[in-house]
């Protein structure tokens, strides 16, 4: 046969799905790999052909159109199953072709198994909302396309196991779950169960998002270095090892890209020729407000390193800051010599 | 467990147009907490029911209000107190009205479970 | 903004008799409704909550059903005591510019117990 521009198995997209419940799997090609749509490649002669490839098996196989109830069928660039099944994990296909064309690409499939508190191995994806901030919403995902305009599903939204039903400050709104306040309690995986009947069946679509509470943008603050600060002096004598830490509180933000970094004598550790080294941890608190501590490390120090400028500093979107360390040599106590006179008694 | 209604004054909440008041609500018998909303209605003589807004009782206090508010009145609440306030600026004569306290225990369904008795305010010149 | 419309107004039947009261939503609110009774002189009493739950207390022949745009509120075996003014209370959320909360009570329905 002809050659075919293969764009490999493209685990970029890992698809997940739940078993017994209806699918809609578009070919990626056109999504990520060719720069134009399945409309204009089938006004153009191309055919889209699908095929999979069984789980732990290597052998191609044509998918089965004709199985009881269209179970799976393709519509324009979407494969449907209607509903999963489990056997129907493997690896898929879609090719597009003609007499002188040829572009595929396969991604996998994974129908997965949930019990009845909706627990499963599913990546989930996560939902942040900002603490007390005021009303926010998520929305059922990925139901698009599932059932026309015309027909009113039925939505249920669970926290982990438990209907949302006089939730205190929670709204179920359809497809929308409105956090008139979010509060750390409301921290956990929430469901929406979509109902909706297609030719005399009913189908439900389970959707699992986790919401985790994060720092409000009204309370975010710039860096706070909290070390080195006024009241803390380093003194070292020559071939001792001095050690710094600078310890930065960065309020949460979105999207923020959090920095620490030493400069000594206004250049970088990496720009210098002393032997320094430096190590980094991070924590975050509940809000995912995060600390940062950068300890700055110099084993044999010398009495020139004693006179250099330490200089910490941090960035976030608030802001910049910076705080020098108090580094000094420490003076030698004075050695006294005592003369013990004797005999200075009285006669 | 009741709401305990104040405000209005030795004048039993007769205020002259332009004039301000404010009316508290005070919880007995339960704490105000995270766990509650203070909302706040008013019923003008022989009118219907008409929400005016609710403060969230946990720590942030956050509002929300009916748009025809537009400003003029304020929700406040004090934990430590167990009493949330309405505090009503630029009254006019169409402001007449009983003003009702009501604790919300969901504030998604609206389950305003338990009530103040009422302050009646009176705007006239 | 959210508008309520409750129909009718007044409504009247006989001890022992069935009256329904409905509400209508201007959006629809899911079941995100509330019904008080109020008799005069005072404070309005919760009766039903989320559209169909009843509030603890209130007898089993006061029950709501509905959703989305419209609601009913149905008292069977009337009694005379339930002689009172009844309103819906709809309640949704508003994103936008200004993200806010709509609690809109209905213009209220007269009972009448003959």
């Known amino acids: 046969s002809e050659r075919c521009d293969d764009w490999g198995l493209d685990t970029m997209r890992q698809i997940q799905v739940f078993e017994d419940e209806p699918a809609r799997i578009k070919c990626p090609l056109f999504e990520h790999f060719l720069k134009f749509n399945y409309s204009t490649a089938h006004s153009a002669g191309l055919t889209l052909i699908w095929y999979w490839t069984r789980q732990d098996r290597d052998l191609e196989e044509p998918i089965n159109f004709r199985l009881p109830e269209n179970r799976i069928s393709k519509e324009k660039d979407v494969l449907w199953f209607r509903p999963t099944l489990l056997n129907d994990t493997g690896n898929y296909t879609c090719m597009l072709r003609n007499t002188t064309y040829c572009s595929k690409v396969a991604f996998p499939l994974e129908v997965v198994q949930k019990d009845s508190c909706f627990n499963s191995p599913m990546k989930l994806p996560v939902h942040k909302l900002y603490i007390e901030y005021g009303i926010q919403r998520i929305t059922c995902p990925n139901v698009d396309g599932y059932f026309p305009s015309s027909v009113k599903p039925t939505i249920t939204w669970y926290m982990g196991c438990y209907k949302i039903q006089n939730f205190n400050n929670v709204i179920p709104e359809g497809m929308n779950l409105s956090f008139l306040i979010a509060l750390i309690s409301n921290n956990g995986n929430y469901t929406c169960v979509v109902t909706y009947p297609e030719n005399g069946r009913t189908f439900h679509l389970t959707r699992t998002l986790t919401v985790k509470v994060v720092g409000s943008p009204k309370n975010a603050v710039p860096p706070v270095i909290h070390s080195p600060n006024d009241h803390v002096v380093y003194e070292k004598e020559p071939g001792e090892e001095l050690l710094i830490p600078c310890t930065v509180y960065f309020s949460f933000l979105m999207d923020s890209r959090n920095e620490v970094w030493w400069t000594i004598d206004g250049k970088k550790p990496d720009d210098i020729t002393i032997d320094v080294t430096i190590n980094e941890s991070i924590s975050h608190s509940r809000t995912e407000d995060e600390t940062r501590t950068q300890i700055l490390s110099i084993k044999k120090v010398t009495s020139e390193d004693l006179k250099r400028s330490y200089v910490c500093h941090a960035r976030s979107a608030k802001g910049e800051v910076a705080k020098a360390a108090k580094v000094k040599q420490k003076v030698p106590a004075p050695r006294y010599t005592v003369e013990l006179a004797c005999g200075f008694g009285a006669t | 467990q009741q709401l305990e209604q104040s405000g209005g004054g030795a004048e039993g909440g007769l205020v002259k147009p332009g004039g301000s008041l404010e009316l508290c609500c005070k919880a007995s018998g339960f704490s105000l907490g995270s766990s509650y909303w203070i909302c706040w209605v008013r019923q003008a003589p022989g009118k219907g029911l008409e929400w005016i807004g609710c403060i969230y009782a946990g720590s942030s206090g956050i509002t929300y209000y009916a748009s025809w508010v537009s400003g003029r009145f304020t929700l406040s609440r004090d934990i430590d107190q167990s009493t949330g306030c309405l505090q009503l600026n630029s009254l006019t004569a169409a402001d007449t009205a009983m003003y009702y306290c009501?604790?919300?225990?969901?504030?998604?369904?609206?389950?305003?479970?338990?009530w103040g008795q009422g302050t009646l305010v009176t705007v006239s010149s | 903004a959210l508008v309520m419309t409750q129909t009718p107004s007044p409504v009247s039947a006989a001890v022992g008799g069935t009256v329904t009261i409905n509400c209508q939503a201007s959006e629809d609110i899911y079941s995100n409704l509330a019904w008080f009774q109020q008799k005069p002189g005072q404070p309005p009493k919760l009766l039903i909550y989320q559209a169909s739950t009843l509030a603890s207390g209130v007898p089993s022949r006061f029950s709501g059903s509905g959703s989305g745009t419209e609601f009913t509120l149905t008292i069977s075996g009337l009694q005379s005591d339930d002689a009172a003014a009844y309103y819906c209370?709809?309640?949704?959320?508003?994103?936008?510019?200004?993200?806010?909360?709509?609690?809109?009570f209905g213009g209220g329905t007269e009972v009448v117990v003959k």
């Open positions: 209370l709809g309640v949704c959320t508003y994103i936008g510019a200004d993200n806010t909360l709509y609690n809109t």
């Open positions: 009501a604790r919300d225990i969901y504030a998604s369904t609206s389950g305003y479970d338990l």
